[in-house]
């Protein structure tokens, strides 16, 4: 059973390592994949002394942990590299850090990337 699923056909693309990887630095990435597989968008970034450094954004392969996530939100507490994934076109355009620990109340830190 799948409720209210949104198709992902394209995602915001960004690669901080674009010269070495020989890719574009930024743009829109069409998401390809098998017909029976779902597609997602993702974002990875670092927080260097309070400054947000985007590592990559783009399409992400079918992953059950991305299902039913309409917003790109990292919920892990203090990760080394922040990661989020989501479903829906360009849903990785904005991403946020919203740590949800077992006991303490979460605080939201939304981030709008400026590549």
């Amino acid at each position: 059973a799948i409720l209210g699923r949104s198709e992902t056909q394209e995602c915001l693309f960004f690669n901080a390592n674009w010269e070495k990887d020989r890719t574009n630095q930024t743009g829109v990435e069409p998401c390809y994949g098998d017909k029976d597989k779902r597609r997602h968008c993702f974002a990875t970034w670092k927080n260097i002394s309070g400054s947000i450094e985007i590592v990559k954004q783009g399409c992400w392969l079918d992953d059950i942990n991305c299902y039913d996530r309409t917003d790109c939100v990292e919920k892990k507490d203090s990760p080394e590299v922040y990661f989020c994934c989501c479903e829906g076109n360009m849903c990785n355009e904005k991403f946020s850090y919203f740590p949800q620990m077992e006991v303490t109340q979460p605080t939201s830190n939304p981030v709008t990337p400026k590549p």
């Epitope: 799948i2 409720l3 597989k37 779902r38 992953d63 942990n65 299902y67 039913d68 892990k76 077992e102």
Partner: antibody, heavy 118, light 111 residues
């Protein structure tokens, strides 16, 4: 420390029902997809069911479709497997497993034994 | 129906190297199936060894490595030890919320 504790197993007659529970602790339950995997005596592992973070998407192996229902209560940090119309071939140890990005099972419970016999 | 195949059994000498493989009947295994590997000793819950083709799980010794070999996923154990004697299972994530386990490989460490 991540802990997954299954309960609810036992002896049941063919055609009967059981509800398995998996109590999760040591991580933020509502952030991760979850799954059930079983192992019949002397046999290999078999994936049974999976559920997304919200519970909005549920998935089953063909042999249990229409008989088993997976659900989760994110406020209680608990995963469930409602098993109806049980058959002898459902006899197995049932494990709950936490699923992480790239869809792998990163933590496992110790399992609960379900025996279907008359 | 997708069937994931593994060698039913394998033997290795202590200190030797063994490669277990994982294929399926519908084509080639690629990284898009997120192959993962699990070790299980009798009466115990499975232990996660390798995920996402080649990433070692926390606490897993670097004697264990994962890869794609030809059209199969592979688990290589180098410098095999007596306590590596276990059952090893590969899992492929088929997408759309579905996983398929291989039948498992029973690894015997000789001697």
């Amino acid at each position: 420390e991540v802990q997954l504790l299954e309960s609810g197993g036992g002896l049941v007659q063919p055609g009967g029902s059981l509800r398995l529970s998996c109590a999760a602790s040591g991580f933020t339950f509502r952030n991760d997809a979850m799954s059930w995997v079983r192992q019949a005596p002397g046999k290999g592992l078999e994936w049974v069911s999976g559920i997304s973070v919200t519970g909005g998407s549920t998935f089953y192996t063909d042999s249990v479709k229409g008989r088993f229902t997976v659900s989760r209560d994110n406020s209680r940090n608990t995963l469930y497997l409602q098993m109806n119309s049980l058959r002898a071939e459902d006899t197995a140890v049932y494990y709950c497993a936490k699923v992480y990005y790239t869809s792998f099972f990163d933590y496992w419970g110790q399992g609960t034994l379900v025996t279907v016999s008359s | 129906q997708t069937v994931v195949t593994q060698e039913p059994s394998f033997s290795v000498s202590p200190g030797g190297t063994v490669t277990l493989t994982c294929g399926f009947n519908s084509g080639s295994v690629s990284t898009s199936y997120y192959p993962s590997w699990y070790q299980q000793t009798p009466g115990q819950a499975p232990r996660t060894l390798i995920y996402n083709t080649n990433t070692r799980s926390s606490g897993v010794p670097d004697r264990f490595s994962g890869s794609i070999l030809g059209n199969k996923a592979a688990l290589t154990i180098t410098g095999a030890q007596a306590d590596d004697e276990s059952d090893y299972y590969c899992v492929l994530y088929m997408g759309s919320g579905i996983w398929v386990f291989g039948g498992g490989t029973k690894l015997t460490v000789l001697g």
